[in-house]
């Protein structure tokens, strides 16, 4: 009888009577910043080392009674979820605990900062294998805490944190809002977001993925073999820390970017009921529940991509929003989205030696989002080719003219306010897949990449009648790199990638006449890397 949460994260091919996936994370050390722990609990005995680090505030209230088993409760449970002998995810992982939360579960930003510095110094003094840092805590947004997480992540440490239990936008909390941290929301046995009293799991664009976080059985500090159920995003984060330990033990050279992409890739897709989230957060919140990879090796051949949403631009006329990829990722395409439909498109531009995706609000618009498609593409050489607004009535077009470069994404950006309101749609001439087309008033940007063995193709799906949503997906073995709408449909709110599907959203069809302007075409650019496939075959 395996606890539901371990069954949920386990691919079917591991599911025997017992949960025993290959290699239990034995090459990885997981640091836990939490309460004190009961290190002699049978679940974690011999696998958790209690460091001498302690930085906690005084408990509130004069009548507070410090009871050891209560003080240890949260940390002991999480240590058990990560590496417990029976109810743990990564049974082979070794752990080190730092006490940054007091007996009431409260801590300070300064205590956490000093804890992170302690880990950094430990790493410098005695470098070991891959490190995972679990931060099962959330407080108000802190620029300084996010910066400390960024520094540690750039030193090669994987940080996993709880999204927070405030039924709120995770971007308002730290360290959940730090882009370098893997931020985890919580789901239950029905794959629904976890409700905790009147609150529940946080959500939004700062969440990377969800994981089991309700009624999670783990070590209880009540006795040395006791178990207890606990719930929250801390428990969810502990699952992902365990999965990360398993992945890193199988492939110790994985970078943070590679690990994050794999976590996303192997997650269960589209199983969460999004109706639980506020309407404006649904599109921003990833519908992903973490799972172990079906095989710990052989994922290297795939072209991994993820979608990164920017913060909202705000409603001012010239407002822009910027979405960025991680340092090790390539920006392969850029799109934009506005709930009001008033936007002036998007463009890829260089910023600090790296491409970013910038979306532009329009007059009267309520604001825009920029959506970056961020991919792992080793030895890539990517550039943006821009065509200014065309004079010809055929519209603007741009293609990848350099030898060996392929088109991975198209963006368009315009200066006029209501582009295309009374313009007929511009259709791409057939047989010219390697080019982007757009309105003559728009400048068009093509993302062109050269990488060994990279090949891409364009896939379109057009619907003549008005539809609120049109989608087109890449087939098995191909990865979505670009997602855009064919120009000419004035009521398009924008385009974005969800996993391997390109989604084009339009205004409520009841407000749109079914004229030719009602036609909506979603354009997906699907790529694969034969070079990566061959390299992985050589490794087998």
């Amino acid at each position: 009888s395996i606890p539901w949460n371990l069954e949920r994260i386990t691919p079917p091919r591991y599911r025997a009577d017992e949960y025993q996936p290959p290699d239990g994370g034995s090459l990885v050390e997981v640091y836990l910043l939490d309460t004190s722990i009961q290190s002699d609990h049978r679940e974690i005995e011999g696998r958790v080392m209690v460091t001498d680090f302690e930085n906690v505030p005084e408990e509130d209230g004069t009548r507070f009674h410090r009871q050891a088993s209560k003080c240890d409760s949260h940390g002991t449970h999480l240590a058990g979820v990560v590496s417990g002998r029976d109810a743990g995810v990564a049974k082979g992982a070794s752990m080190r605990s730092l006490r940054v939360l007091n007996c009431q579960g409260k801590g300070t930003v300064s205590g956490t900062l000093i804890g992170l510095e302690f880990i950094r110094k430990s790493q410098l003094v005695q470098p070991v294998g891959p490190l995972v840092v679990l931060l099962p805590l959330a407080g108000g947004y802190s620029r300084v805490l996010n910066a400390a997480c960024q520094r540690l992540a750039r030193a090669g440490v994987v940080l996993v944190t709880a999204a927070g239990n405030f039924r709120d936008d995770a971007c308002l909390y730290s360290p959940a809002s730090a882009p370098e941290v893997i931020t985890v929301g919580a789901t239950n046995a029905q794959d629904q977001p976890v409700t905790l009293g009147t609150l529940g799991t946080n959500f939004g664009r700062c969440v990377d993925l969800f994981a089991p976080g309700e009624d999670i059985i783990g070590a209880s500090s009540d006795c040395s073999t006791c178990f207890v159920s606990q719930s929250g995003t801390s428990q969810a984060a502990a699952h992902v820390a365990g999965i990360a330990a398993m992945m890193l033990s199988a492939e110790p050279e994985l970078t943070l970017a590679e690990l994050r992409q794999r976590l996303i890739h192997f997650s269960a897709k589209d199983v969460i009921n999004e109706a639980w989230f506020p309407e404006d957060q649904r599109v921003l919140t990833p519908n992903l529940v973490a799972a172990l990879p079906p095989s710990t090796h052989g994922a290297g051949w795939q072209l991994f991509c993820r979608t990164v949403w920017s913060a909202h631009s705000g409603p001012t006329r010239m407002a822009t929003a910027v979405a960025r990829c991680a340092p090790d990722e390539e920006l392969l395409s850029c799109s934009s989205f506005s709930r009001s439909g008033k936007r002036r498109g998007e463009r890829m531009e260089a910023q600090g030696g790296k491409l970013v995706c910038r979306a532009h609000n329009a007059f009267g618009g309520e604001g825009v989002y920029a959506i970056a498609r961020c991919c792992l593409l080793p030895q890539a050489n990517c550039s943006v080719h821009t065509a200014p607004p065309a004079e010809a009535s055929m519209g603007t077009r741009v293609h990848c003219h350099q030898q060996g470069h392929v088109l991975t994404g198209c963006s368009s950006h315009w200066e006029v306010e209501d582009l295309g309101t009374h313009k007929p749609p511009v259709l791409r001439p057939r047989g010219q897949p390697n080019q982007c087309v757009g309105h003559r008033e728009a400048s068009i940007h093509a993302s062109c990449c050269h990488a060994p063995g990279l090949e891409c193709k364009v896939k379109e799906h057009g619907i003549p009648a008005p539809q609120e949503q049109v989608t087109v997906a890449c087939e098995e073995g191909w990865t979505l790199t670009g997602c855009s709408a064919l120009p000419g449909t004035s009521h398009v709110l924008g385009a974005y990638a969800v996993d391997n599907t390109c989604v084009v959203r339009s205004r409520d069809v009841s407000t749109t006449g079914s004229t030719s302007e009602g036609a909506v075409t979603a354009v997906a650019i699907c790529c694969r890397s034969r070079h990566l496939a061959q390299a992985s075959q050589e490794l087998q």
Epitope: R42, A87, S220, D222, S224, T225
Partner: antibody, heavy 118, light 108 residues
Framework: QVQLLESGGGLVQPGGSLRLSCKAS????????IYWVRQAPGKGLEWIGW????????RYNQKFQSKATISRDNSKNTLYLQMNSLRAEDTAVYYC???????????WGQGTLVTVSS | EIVLTQSPATLSLSPGERATITCRAS??????LNWYQQKPGQAPRLLIY???NRATGIPARFSGSGSGTDFTLTISSLEPEDFAVYYC??????????FGGGTKVEIK
Amino acid sequence: QVQLLESGGGLVQPGGSLRLSCKASGYTFSSYSIYWVRQAPGKGLEWIGWIDPGNGGTRYNQKFQSKATISRDNSKNTLYLQMNSLRAEDTAVYYCARARVGYSLDYWGQGTLVTVSS
Amino acid sequence: EIVLTQSPATLSLSPGERATITCRASQYVGSYLNWYQQKPGQAPRLLIYDASNRATGIPARFSGSGSGTDFTLTISSLEPEDFAVYYCQVWDSSPPVVFGGGTKVEIK
């Protein structure tokens, strides 16, 4: 080899008291807790309490809280179970057993029979 | 408080037959469950610890399996000396030591 030898059982009057002894040998006395368990005739096993000889800490089954007192004499490697206000239903074989908390009761004494009767 | 339910209460078998005793915990206990054998007039003896590990000197015909809430003690081929009462046991917070009600394996 590890040995636990009980003594002190016998016939007791209702309302009376008695002290059982458990002499330990063959291992480091302070490294294992000692548990007292009893078994009424034809019945199952019932835990009474335990003592950690290292620090003298004790813990009791709620049911025996006011009836049983467990103590130790480290110089003699001996544990004691003092039972007061005995009644007919306390008639049982009393065992001592050793364990590390959370592990198994790996060695048991041979048991000593206590009969409460007038 | 954890409750351990053993079944059957009595098992009537002949020597050479296979005996299967189950122990169900009222809540999750991982693999931290032990099995003991008690012969008439003797103290209990540890057979299996941590659900599946044979104690020192215990013959290979005794095996334990299970985890979580459902556990099994199996005697592959009963010897005359195996007819006894078998108890499962776990640890809890209060009371810390919990025994099952016992299963008597008797000669048919």
